[in-house]
């Protein structure tokens, strides 16, 4: 992937739109939308003023760890859906799109240098462990997905892209 493709806001917006669509189709869906287990996902909240004071490398650590955990969670959701007796087709479609989207975003972040940045800061090892929450429905899973994209990921790429412009 071109190194700074993710710096084009339209790219992230495309994935965000997909995530919001997925969240919307699960609104009010009970019958097909339970995960039947608790899946660990990243907490999409941040300590606002601490985040603002963070080095971009520390932000990269949080985003990279969060993206990895979110990818695992969506893959687990996909596996549970495949194993269910009658997977609901619209849900299947959006889970597959989310898996594909997270793979692409991982590639785009790697191209931006997020992985390298996440490893390089001297305080990366002492960074606080990633805060997590659990999701027991596809609605919660997709909400975390869309909140992660429009939250930490957008904040980090904005900062990383700005830093790269200097």
């Amino acid at each position: 992937a071109p190194p700074r493709l993710i710096c084009d806001s339209r790219v992230l917006e495309r994935y965000l739109l997909e995530a919001k669509e997925a969240e919307n189709i699960t609104t009010g869906c009970a019958e097909h939308c339970s995960l039947n287990e608790n899946i660990t996902v990243p907490d999409t909240k941040v300590n606002f003023y601490a985040w603002k004071r963070m080095e971009v490398g520390q932000q990269a650590v949080e985003v990279w760890q969060g993206l990895a955990l979110l990818s695992e969670a969506v893959l687990r959701g996909q596996a549970l859906l495949v194993n269910s007796s009658q997977p609901w087709e619209p849900l299947q479609l959006h889970v597959d799109k989310a898996v594909s989207g997270l793979r692409s975003l991982t590639t785009l972040l790697r191209a931006l240098g997020a992985q390298k940045e996440a490893i390089s800061p001297p305080d990366a090892a002492s960074a606080a462990p990633l805060r997590t929450i659990t999701a027991d429905t596809f609605r919660k899973l997709f909400r975390v997905y869309s909140n992660f994209l429009r939250g930490k990921l957008k904040l980090y790429t904005g900062e990383a892209c700005r830093t790269g412009d200097r």
């Epitope: 941040v46 601490a50 939250g151």
Partner: antibody
């Protein structure tokens, strides 16, 4: 339940210093997620944010540009309170002054909001 | 500095729906918070992050935000809803909160 109790004089002479205190109960001024603010309200300027203090491994202050040269917000950890000092006041500084807590542990796509407020103190600047 | 524009007053009959607007350049891309202030009292947060309600705030209070306008909607208006309402956003250029001028809601 967080409560903020304000104290301080209601009348200040021009060119003098306005001093107010906000005592916190139900939370800590050294909280690692909240920020502690002063906001004022007057008929001519509406609600106007003045500044904040917060602790994230060390103390930080942010001030509104228009008052930056004459404002100090100080935390007092021993009394679990924070104070406002506004120097060289003029009649334009006449307003109701509020202290307020800003919740800072929020969704990453959001911005902090004021979830608890003091009762307000009307401060009149007049000789 | 980012400017928020609110109508000075809105009137509504009890049981009807009140809509209070807050205008700002591309406000839809920002998070909007709403406060209610009754005479002689401090403001109270009624909606945050465009549409979320703090605990204790009735479901009658809801919010939306897109384009250049954010809206606070109060359904089944009661006499006790009569107050001033303020919107608030974050001015990212100066890293500080900005308030709208306020809207006086009158229940007829």
């Amino acid at each position: 339940q967080v409560q903020l109790q304000q104290s301080g004089p209601g009348l200040v002479k021009p060119s003098q210093t306005l001093s107010l205190t906000c005592a916190i109960s139900g939370d800590s001024v050294s909280s690692n997620s909240a920020a502690w603010n002063w906001i004022r309200q007057s008929p001519s300027r509406g609600l106007e944010w003045l500044g904040r203090t917060y602790y994230r491994s060390k103390w930080y202050n942010d001030y509104e540009v228009s008052v930056k040269s004459r404002i100090i917000i100080n935390p007092d950890t021993s009394k679990n309170q924070f104070s406002l000092q506004l120097n060289s006041v003029t009649p334009e500084d006449t307003a109701v002054y509020y202290c307020a807590r800003e919740e800072g542990y929020i969704e990453a796509h959001s911005v902090p909001y004021f979830d608890y407020w003091g009762q307000g103190t009307l401060v009149t600047v007049s000789s | 500095s980012y400017v928020l524009t609110q109508p000075p007053s809105v009137s509504v009959a009890p049981g009807q729906t009140a809509r209070i607007t807050c205008g700002g350049n591309n406000i839809g891309s920002k998070s909007v918070h709403w406060y209610q202030q009754k005479p002689g009292q401090a403001p109270v947060l009624v909606v945050y992050d465009d549409s979320d309600r703090p605990s204790g705030i009735p479901e009658r209070f809801s919010g939306s935000n897109s384009g250049n306008t954010a809206t606070l909607t109060i359904s089944w208006v009661e006499a006790g809803d009569e107050a001033d309402y303020y919107c608030q956003v974050w001015d990212s250029s100066g890293d500080h909160p900005v308030f709208g001028g306020g809207t006086k809601l009158t229940v007829l």
